[in-house]
């Protein structure tokens, strides 16, 4: 037999299918020009020493073969002895290691069998009523096709599906969408209405994320507040990467999960902008304010479940940085200015179990005064910090108040509001004999002591009503008792106590009269 012809003799090997798992498959035959034809196939398994034979049976029942050697592609003309206008059955037999392996048969009319392409170029993926919709441009001059898809997940083998007949310039397919795992899809096409025509090759992989992006599993921590009033938010655990099917590993456009960080600054609610969204890779610096941080995962189908973390406020206080002066017109605060043209946010909140909402005020951008201080003033009528109770004050600063990540903490401290000197006056002053020349003076703690760092000291004044001599005794703010010694029996004394802050001298308590009785010996 000539090599260019189909040989109508018995092939040069025994006729027995080994039934092995390897062997030839995916046989495709089609016309490639007016008078030439091509068949190609795949071979699975070791290729060394394998000889391939393309078998053909005509409708008359006569059969022939082409010897392809080690090649998996073979061309022949319409003069090769194979009928091209009538239906023929073709298959491949591969002779290897003393056994024959057979491909599945294809039955077709060669003249009408056109080589169909798989979907080429961009395959658009969208979600439609809980299913996956794929859409692509029909390859040139190939309108009218049957389309199949196959899909797999990281843990499952290929499953075959049907897209149905297509007859337009664009083709589409509805496929199943997995909720929680990524999928790899491939598509193939063949001529519509041409009985037994060959399937095209499979398309390049189309990688599809799960409907729900994976929930981010992250952990945050926050560093100490630095000298600049900012602290770094750090990510302790990166989000886990999505497991991908084999053909999507490496570069897998379409399956990407993006993680975004949504910052919500809870402190200073009077500022212009409370939230900001950032990429997870770019960890921001924060002020000492309280924040909620949401990590939002999203893929091409939209956002998924988020995870929300709370970053408590940094409550480290600076007891001396804030100077408060109370005048007849109102109250003014002074603190070391940060820089030129800074906007400050002053926030105050009543301290204690009843909590109470934080109130704040935003200053216009201001430069430092000649002493390098920034100021904020308010009138008594405004009612700000007007109640006689303890307030926690925080001052934030920013040169760009519209940018959430550029705020810094200037200071945090406590302040006793209202008329602190009067409100702080100690009550329930009592005097008890201690010895022949001394007494113990006790009092109830001043209201100022509920405000950390505000009460500087108590002062106890003792006045000798005879000589009008006065002595004053400073007492630590944590103490509520002092012993007065060197007193004389039979003399009348008055004792008073006051509570002082760093800025204000307190109001004396009501005078308490006492005397040490003269001891009469028998």
């Amino acid at each position: 037999c000539r090599t260019s012809e189909c040989c109508f003799q018995d092939p040069p090997y025994p006729d027995a299918d080994s039934g092995s798992a390897s062997g030839p498959r995916d046989l495709r035959c089609y016309r490639i020009s007016s008078d030439r034809y091509e068949c190609s196939w795949q071979y699975e398994g070791p290729t060394a020493g394998v000889s391939h034979f393309l078998r053909c049976c005509l409708s008359s029942g006569r059969c022939c073969y082409f010897a392809a050697g080690s090649a998996t592609r073979l061309q022949f003309s319409d003069q090769a002895g194979v009928s091209v206008l009538y239906t023929v059955t073709l298959w491949v037999e591969s002779w290897a290691r003393n056994q024959t392996e057979k491909s599945p048969e294809v039955t077709l009319q060669l003249y009408n069998s056109v080589k169909y392409e798989p979907p080429l170029g961009d395959i658009k993926v969208s979600k439609l009523a809980g299913q996956l919709r794929m859409e692509w441009e029909t390859p040139d001059n190939q309108v009218g096709a049957e389309v199949q898809f196959r899909h797999r997940t990281p843990s499952s083998p290929w499953k075959l599906g049907d897209c149905g007949p297509q007859d337009d310039d664009t083709e589409s397919c509805l496929c199943p969408l997995e909720m929680n795992v990524a999928q790899e899809f491939q598509l193939r096409r063949r001529q519509l209405g041409s009985q037994g025509s060959s399937w095209s090759k499979w398309s390049s992989p189309v990688c599809v994320p799960p409907e729900n992006p994976p929930q981010p599993q992250v952990r945050f921590s926050v560093e100490q507040l630095g000298q600049d009033g900012r602290r770094r938010l750090t990510l302790k655990e990166q989000p886990t990467q999505l497991e991908l099917p084999e053909g999507c590993q490496g570069l897998a456009p379409g399956t990407e999960v993006t993680y975004r960080l949504q910052l919500h600054m809870l402190s200073c609610p009077c500022k212009a902008k409370a939230t900001r969204t950032l990429h997870l890779g770019k960890m921001p610096y924060l002020s000492g304010a309280a924040y909620n941080v949401a990590v939002i995962s999203s893929n091409q189908f939209g956002p998924g479940l988020n995870q929300t973390w709370h970053i408590p406020a940094d409550t480290h206080t600076e007891p001396v940085a804030l100077n408060i002066s109370v005048g007849t017109n109102g109250t003014t605060m002074y603190w070391p200015a940060r820089a030129q043209s800074m906007t400050y946010c002053i926030e105050w909140q009543p301290v204690g179990q009843d909590g109470g909402l934080a109130t704040c005020s935003l200053t216009a951008p201001q430069d430092p005064d000649p002493a390098g201080m920034a100021t904020y003033s308010w009138s008594r009528e405004s009612g700000a910090m007007g109640q006689e109770k303890c307030y926690y004050i925080t001052i934030f600063a920013s040169a760009h108040p519209e940018k959430l990540t550029l705020w810094s903490t200037v200071l945090s401290t406590y302040h006793f509001g209202g008329n602190a000197s009067a409100a702080g006056t100690p009550h329930h002053v009592s005097v008890k004999n201690h010895s022949l020349d001394s007494v113990s003076v006790d009092w109830a703690p001043s209201l100022l002591s509920t405000c950390p760092g505000v009460l500087k000291e108590y002062v106890v004044r003792c006045r000798d009503e005879d000589s009008k001599q006065v002595s004053e005794h400073p007492v630590q703010p944590t103490e509520t008792q002092v012993t007065l010694s060197g007193l004389r029996a039979g003399v009348a004394y008055t004792v008073q106590v006051r509570a002082d802050t760093a800025w204000l001298r307190g109001v004396w308590s009501q005078p308490q009269r006492f005397s040490i009785e003269v001891q009469v010996s028998d």
């Epitope: 995870q307 973390w309 709370h310 408590p312 179990q353 909590g355 909402l357």
Partner: nanobody, 126 residues
Framework: EVQLVESGGGLVQAGGSLRVACAAS????????MAWFRQAPGKEREFVAH????????VYPDSVRGRFTISRDNAKNTVYLQMNSLKPEDTAVYYC???????????????????WGQGTSVTVSS
Amino acid sequence: EVQLVESGGGLVQAGGSLRVACAASGRTFSTYAMAWFRQAPGKEREFVAHILWSGGSTVYPDSVRGRFTISRDNAKNTVYLQMNSLKPEDTAVYYCAQKSGRQVYRIDSWDSFDYWGQGTSVTVSS
């Protein structure tokens, strides 16, 4: 120790409203935040609402935002969950949880909280 007791659950028609309460007792001065979670039969526990004890800032998931409101009465040491426009899928046992201390924590995770109540059952019929 902190003890949490939920109340106010019951049966309600779809579209109706219900208010559940959680009363805290014991070392409540250490409370930093409170939250509500819920668990429907055969499902995982789900975050519903969160409130800071001081200041009252709140967080909700998309599933209840706009329908549920968390609030607190510090003087009574009680946190409330007002549920409006109830749906059959809101049927669950509702638990309140308390957070002490001031460390960084995940708001929507049951494990972040230090104390939990026994739960109150809410059934929404269609």
